[in-house]
Interface confidence: low
């Protein structure tokens, strides 16, 4: 004789009782009414199960909550099922058996039917696990039921001080969706908040789980697929104040079935977004966007932000959204890079794009901008990187495309190619009024517009000029004069550890900033506009340094241990970290600080010039770094502002030294023999290069490196030309937000 092997199968669900009404008392687990009604309801549930063939497998059950509508009972029950039958008793099958029983007019009228009129239609049965019940039970000392009426924003009461776990059980009108807003009120905590697309904490219905006070998402809004949601909080460390605020509302289902007709132009024409963007998309999201293109000359480009698409085998679910584009199945995934999906047009009836959430786990709302591109020339003057759909500079010495194809088959790399014989001349010799090419092609078209390319400067009117680095050189090269606008910059006022450096004089580096917390120098920075200082994002990676309120910015400073009349200090009103910054890789290591009031420029305080995206800093060029960093590896910060000259290093040489961990957003400078370098405390400080015009341009920001001044290991800087679009975007959008 062999004992039959059974497995415990847990089911969770809800049922509606038509002849009972919900009362406030039933919403409180500690009330007498709750205890009495839950005991009766549990008996009813037990009898209901016992009346079916599931009765023989019954183990235990619990009615753990009540809700509106007229009275909804939320429950779980466990069946001990023979192993061989486990797969046959799915939640759908169990529901069917229970519904059949509710609809049957059996002669022996079960006692549960006399007292409870259960609505068969409203029966919900979901798969659960023993662990789900454990989690649920751990919250019962702090269980909060709330019914969310339409139109109201309901703030949810924070957790009780003495409890370690709470559950907010949220329910709204059946035809609406629950939307929860979670706002972290502190920057450091170890609390965990999980949201479920069900009345209880069912792992299989998890929408999202956040741990600690999320700096990436200080405020998040999360949608359920329908009118119920459970939010579970687990305490991290003791705190007198709640580290978060919760509120909830019931919102209407938003349609995302759109037909759009694009116009025959190449700029961005609009965006597609998941309902309630930037809220998390709902587990029930299904969007269908049909875009019609004016002619087959064009292809359609979808521009994603921190989200990309890739092919996925059909038998694998997409965990971050499924996309169907022209019958191709793609899976979305979050990434800290830009991405474009290019859709070549083969038929004139346009393209249908479907976005579907395949699982309950969702993520931040997705927004995609759309535009057209010329199918015959998708990237005028640039290279189309097929890996990520982006147009990147070609043959500039930097492998922008992950496969490096933008730097293959180059006749002249980071140089000008003469038309006559394909000889290469250095870029500063182009349009310098000295013919260097055989027939002088380097000096042609210098006074007129040329097709845009990697090294051409784009004027404000979108035309391009051939002369490299024409900004602020005292000559108007653009028809609209835009190359000579915003030129109140880059002039020295007078006349980190900076390893191998020398002391600076007053006004020599008037853009240099000292970023301090409680009187202690932490990082360097550079003034780029009257309310903006640029620095490195990694200066803020510690939770304890993430708040702008902590920081003071000093400009015009010379010595750390004393103040002098030429220096001024500012509080920081806002802090912007590059959205793609990644701590581990140091990529996109840039941040912007908005000062609390405008800077008054003087001989000792004025901004450095920002380079255009096309600005070329030539490898081999001597530039300067400045800061109060340590003067030897592991040493203390310097008292006096130090300066040191460093040489710009070709990208491939640096990439080799650092085993290919150098991204296109990085620039290297230093010397093979080491010695001269930045060090701890110089982070975020400026690497500046002087143009022939005498103006200083910001080439880089001190970012990372192996040690300080070590032979064969150059200093690595954030390459400003590769993040300049983001810088301009922030300055433009927030210059008025005082």
């Amino acid at each position: 004789y062999k004992a039959e092997v059974t497995v415990s199968q847990v089911y969770s669900g809800s049922l509606r009782v038509l002849n009972r009404h919900f009362s406030q008392d039933l919403g409180r687990r500690e009330s007498i009414a709750f205890r009495s009604e839950s005991a009766k309801a549990q008996k009813m549930l037990q009898e209901l199960v016992a009346s079916t063939r599931l009765g023989t497998y019954y183990n235990s059950s619990s009615v753990y909550s009540f809700g509106e509508g007229p009275l909804t009972c939320f429950f779980w029950f466990i069946l001990d099922i023979p192993e061989y039958q486990r797969l046959t008793l799915s939640p759908e099958v169990v529901r069917e058996l229970l519904v059949d029983e509710l609809l049957s007019n059996s002669s022996t009228l079960a006692s549960y039917k006399t007292e409870y009129e259960v609505d068969p239609e409203g029966l919900v049965i979901l798969e659960a696990s023993v662990n789900d019940i454990v989690v649920l039970n751990s919250t019962l000392g702090c269980y909060r039921y709330s019914y969310v009426n339409p139109g109201q924003v309901l703030p949810l009461k924070g957790p009780d001080q003495q409890t370690t776990s709470c559950l907010w059980h949220l329910q709204g009108p059946e035809d609406l969706m629950i939307k929860v807003r979670l706002e972290w009120t502190r920057v450091d905590c170890r609390d965990r908040v999980a949201m479920y697309d069900a009345a209880g904490p069912l792992e299989k219905r998890l929408i999202t789980s956040v741990y600690g006070c999320s700096r990436q998402e200080p405020v998040m809004e999360v949608l359920a697929s329908g009118s119920v949601m459970a939010v579970v909080w687990k305490k991290g460390m003791h705190s007198y104040y709640d580290p978060f605020l919760l509120s909830v509302k019931s919102v209407a289902f938003q349609d995302c079935q759109v037909n759009l007709t694009l116009e025959g132009r190449l700029d961005t024409q609009g965006f597609l977004r998941t309902p309630y963007y930037p809220s998390y998309y709902s587990p029930s999201t299904h969007c269908s966007w049909h875009l019609t293109v004016p002619s087959l000359d064009y292809g359609l480009a979808l521009w994603f932000d921190a989200y990309a698409l890739r092919r996925q085998k059909y038998n694998r679910l997409c965990t971050q959204g499924q996309w169907m584009i022209q019958n191709r199945r793609l899976c979305g995934f979050r990434t800290l890079q830009p991405y474009a999906e290019r859709i070549p047009m083969v038929a004139s009836d346009g393209v249908t794009i479907n976005f579907t959430s395949q699982i309950s786990l969702t993520g931040p709302g997705v927004q995609v901008y759309y535009s057209l591109y010329n199918q015959s020339d998708p990237c005028p003057g640039e290279f189309l990187c097929s890996v990520n759909g982006l147009c990147v500079p070609a043959c500039d010495g930097i492998k922008d495309c992950p496969n490096g194809l933008d730097e293959r088959n180059c006749v002249c790399r980071a140089m000008f190619q003469c038309q006559e014989d394909s000889t290469c001349i250095s870029l500063p010799r182009v349009c310098d009024r000295q013919p260097d090419c055989l027939n002088g092609s380097d000096e042609e078209q210098c006074q007129e517009g040329v097709p845009c390319g990697t090294f051409t400067f784009q004027c404000e009117d979108r035309s391009c000029v051939k002369k490299p680095n024409p900004e602020c050189d005292g000559q108007s090269d653009c028809r609209d004069g835009s190359d000579e606008q915003h030129c109140d910059c880059g002039l020295q006022g007078l006349s980190s550890r900076i390893v191998g450096g020398t002391v600076s004089s007053e006004g020599e580096w008037p853009w240099q900033a000292s970023l301090q917390i409680r009187g202690r120098h932490i990082c360097g920075g550079a003034l780029i506009a009257d309310r903006w200082v640029i620095t490195a994002a990694h200066c803020f990676q510690e939770d304890s340094m993430a708040s702008p309120k902590l920081w003071t910015v000093f400009l015009g400073k010379m010595r750390q241990n004393s103040r002098w009349p030429g220096e001024v200090s500012f509080k920081v009103s806002r802090l912007f970290l590059h959205p793609y910054h990644e701590e581990d890789s140091h990529d996109y290591d840039v941040a912007l600080l908005q000062l609390d009031h405008p800077v008054v420029y003087s001989a000792t305080v004025r901004p450095v010039c920002l380079p255009a995206r096309s600005h070329f800093f030539e490898p081999g060029q001597h530039c300067w770094i400045t800061g109060w960093g340590a003067q030897r590896e592991g040493g203390p910060v310097s008292n006096t502002l130090q300066k040191v000259d460093v040489q710009l290093v070709p990208q491939d040489l640096c990439s080799e030294a650092y085993r290919y961990q150098v991204s296109p957003r990085m620039l290297c400078a230093g010397y093979r023999k080491g010695k001269k370098d930045a060090c701890q405390g110089d982070s975020g400080g400026p690497l500046v290069c002087r143009e022939p015009s005498g103006r200083w341009f910001l080439a880089g920001l001190v970012s990372w490196g192996l040690g300080c001044g070590r032979p064969n290991f150059f200093g690595v800087y954030t390459r400003v030309t590769r993040v300049i679009n983001w810088i301009q975007q922030v300055l433009t959008h927030h210059h008025h937000h005082h």
């Epitope: 139109g151 961005t268 024409q269 609009g270 959008h733 210059h735 008025h736 005082h738």
Partner: antibody, heavy 118, light 107 residues
Framework: QVQLVQSGAEVKKPGASVKVSCKAS????????MHWVRQAPGQRLEWMGR????????TYSPKFQGRVTIIPDTSANTAYMELSSLRSEDTAVYYC???????????WGQGTLVTVSS | DIQMTQSPKSLSASVGDRVTITCRAS??????LAWYQQKPGQSPKLLIY???TRHSGVPSRFSGSGSGTDFTLTISSLQPEDFATYYC?????????FGQGTKLEIK
């Protein structure tokens, strides 16, 4: 549903100040920017300024800087606009409106007529 | 400040007509442009924002186009309730500025 209800019409003498209130319902003002826009008889709309009630950060039009003050009362879900040193050319209908971040003003109050005359 | 110029200042049209109103910005405002409708004695109502996006509840006969400095509001088939004054507004940078308005009257 979203509603912005403004205080009633005012008659003021030149040099005086006026304070107009804007009570919001159907949404939380802390989630939005609150703007004030005015329209003199037969004239175009003129943006005066805005506030982010979450942190009381204000941005004013240079034309009104120094004369206008916008303040929130988040507990009452209300925004206020005070205009000082009134002159006859300040006679206008004053509107409050809300916006999300960089989007324009999607819902407006019914307007408050302020008449300045001696 | 960014100047906004609308044309025409006024226009007469009949029910069923297709009407176009243009708005020009004195500098590039990308696609940060909104259109409002205002009837006498009423507050403005948002029709279009980000140059082309219809506000919820706005009939599909209203459409917006343009980017940079030149923008257009089109009403494909005029209805009796569309006779009003229309304003454009740049929401690109503060101070936000409005056009002088286009009064649409019944012919």
């Amino acid at each position: 549903q979203v509603q912005l209800v403004q205080s009633g019409a005012e008659v003021k003498k030149p040099g005086a100040s006026v304070k107009v209130s804007c009570k919001a319902s159907g949404f939380n003002i802390e989630d939005y920017y609150m703007h004030w826009v005015r329209q003199a008889p037969g004239q175009r709309l003129e943006w005066m300024g805005r506030i982010d009630p979450e942190d009381a950060e204000t941005t004013y039009s240079p034309k009104f800087q120094g004369r206008v003050t916008i303040i929130p009362d988040t507990s009452a879900n209300t925004a206020y606009m005070e205009l000082s040193s009134l002159r006859s050319e300040d006679t206008a209908v004053y509107y409050c409106a809300r916006s999300i971040y960089l989007d324009p003003m999607d819902y407006w109050g019914q307007g408050t007529l302020v008449t300045v005359s001696s | 400040d960014i100047q906004m110029t609308q044309s025409p200042k006024s226009l007469s049209a009949s029910v069923g007509d297709r009407v176009t109103i243009t708005c020009r910005a004195s500098q590039d405002v990308t696609t940060a442009l909104a259109w409002y409708q205002q009837k006498p004695g009423q507050s403005p109502k948002l029709l279009i924002y980000w140059a082309t996006t219809r506000h919820s509840g706005v009939p599909s006969r209203f459409s917006g186009s343009g980017s940079g400095t030149d923008f257009t509001l089109t009403i494909s088939s005029l209805q009796p309730e569309d006779f009003a004054t229309y304003y454009c507004q740049q929401h690109y940078s503060t101070p936000y500025t409005f056009g002088q308005g286009t009064k649409l009257e019944i012919k």
